[in-house]
């Protein structure tokens, strides 16, 4: 299948150790969970928990597994075919604009606004004007009403692997 090119560091090149299974490439490519040998004649398995590949490929290295940062929780571990899935801790979120770090969710909405969306691992609380219903732009308000936000549940992978 088609592959999303993840931007992980490469694992150090693996010479086939005894635990690394070898198989022949199919039509010149290797299946998920493997990389190709330098001579193109073998597919060598990635190392569980260390590196991975998500799609049919001719990678000479498997891709290094992501380690969740402090401030993140690991939702699912790295396997030979899927990268680690990390999620911001409760009360924090990761914006598309700044995916490198989790930011604290606001604790409440500015005066004259009402909360319509909770803090989730990928978005801050959402506030709208009471009368007009227009969204608040997201800048930190000078005065806040104390509206408690609750964390969302869906997973947000820290490295999407297609």
């Amino acid at each position: 299948e088609s592959a999303l090119i993840t931007q992980q560091d490469l694992a150090p090149q693996q010479r086939a150790a005894p635990q690394q299974k070898r198989s022949s490439p199919s039509e010149g490519l290797c299946p998920p969970g493997h990389h190709i040998s330098e001579d193109g004649r073998d597919c060598i398995s990635c190392k569980y928990g260390q590196d991975y590949s998500t799609h049919w490929n001719d990678l000479l290295f498997c891709l290094r597994c992501t380690r969740c940062d402090s401030g993140e929780v690991e939702l699912s571990p790295c396997t030979t075919t899927r990268n680690t899935v990390c999620q911001c801790e409760e009360g924090t979120f990761r914006e598309e604009d700044s995916p490198e770090m989790c930011r604290k969710c606001r604790t409440g909405c500015p005066r004259g606004m009402v909360k319509v969306g909770d803090c989730t691992p990928w978005s801050d609380i959402e506030c709208v004007h009471k009368e007009s219903g227009t969204k608040h732009s997201g800048e930190v308000p000078a005065v806040e009403e104390t509206v408690t936000s609750s964390p969302g549940t869906p997973a947000s992978p820290c490295s999407l692997s297609g």
Partner: antibody, heavy 119, light 106 residues
Framework: EVMLVESGGGLVQPGGSLRLSCAAS????????MSWVRQTPEKRLEWVAT????????YYPDSVKGRFTISRDNAKNTLYLQMSSLRAEDTAVYYC????????????WGQGTLVTVSS | DIVMTQSPSSLSASVGDRVTITCKAS??????VAWYQQKPGKAPKLLIY???TRHTGVPDRFTGSGSGTDFTLTISSLQPEDFATYFC????????FGQGTKVEIK
């Protein structure tokens, strides 16, 4: 002599579609992994898509995934690139390229076909 | 993605000169580096693969070296037909290219 001849390029509007072809000769086409690589007007080279020798497996970079589809017809010795939802940044010369024997990189390229995305 | 930083972006040289072009990978790529020559309006032509192996028919004045992150293409004695643009490429993780080095006549 290895020969790769691309065709199908032209001027297309943003959001439009185009299908490129690459006719191969001088080697056993069905035995080789093939790719498309493009060269931007600034002369930057970018890998676009790869397909396995039998056509069963394909992969793409993020920049084109979901918009471009690589395919091949081994009976006709032809490689294709179907491009849709084209953007201005897809403007480039598109080359088809063969992955060499035991080298895991491109050894022969075609002469290229120019795709211009503009309104 | 692995970034390949090539230098210089252009250089002027005379026939008979020794020319060196360097390429630096943003992370270890082993020896999975190729060098290509491109002339105006033409397709890139493979010169070197596996960092130092000359492709079929490539004159021995072209030499590649390096491993890990630092790679060099050397033309020992520049010939008139060598004035062109040269690109490095890593192929350890998908394919990424350097920005090119244009070798011009001084």
């Amino acid at each position: 002599e290895v020969m790769l001849v691309e065709s199908g390029g032209g001027l297309v509007q943003p959001g439009g579609s185009l299908r490129l072809s690459c006719a191969a000769s001088g080697f056993t086409f069905s035995s080789y992994v093939m790719s498309w690589v493009r060269q931007t007007p600034e002369k930057r080279l970018e890998w676009v898509a790869t397909i396995s020798s039998g056509g069963s497996y394909t992969y793409y970079p993020d920049s084109v995934k979901g918009r471009f589809t690589i395919s091949r017809d081994n009976a006709k010795n032809t490689l294709y690139l179907q491009m849709s939802s084209l953007r201005a940044e897809d403007t480039a010369v598109y080359y088809c390229a063969r992955r060499g024997d035991s080298m895991i990189t491109t050894d022969y390229w075609g002469q290229g076909t120019l795709v211009t995305v503009s309104s | 993605d692995i970034v390949m930083t090539q230098s210089p972006s252009s250089l002027s040289a005379s026939v008979g000169d020794r020319v060196t072009i360097t390429c630096k990978a943003s992370q270890d790529v082993g020896t999975a580096v190729a060098w290509y020559q491109q002339k105006p309006g033409k397709a890139p032509k493979l010169l070197i693969y596996w960092a130092s192996t000359r492709h079929t028919g490539v004159p021995d004045r072209f030499t590649g070296s390096g491993s890990g992150t630092d790679f060099t293409l050397t033309i020992s004695s520049l010939q008139p037909e060598d004035f062109a643009t040269y690109f490095c490429q890593q192929y350890s993780s998908y394919r990424t290219f350097g920005q090119g080095t244009k070798v011009e006549i001084k």
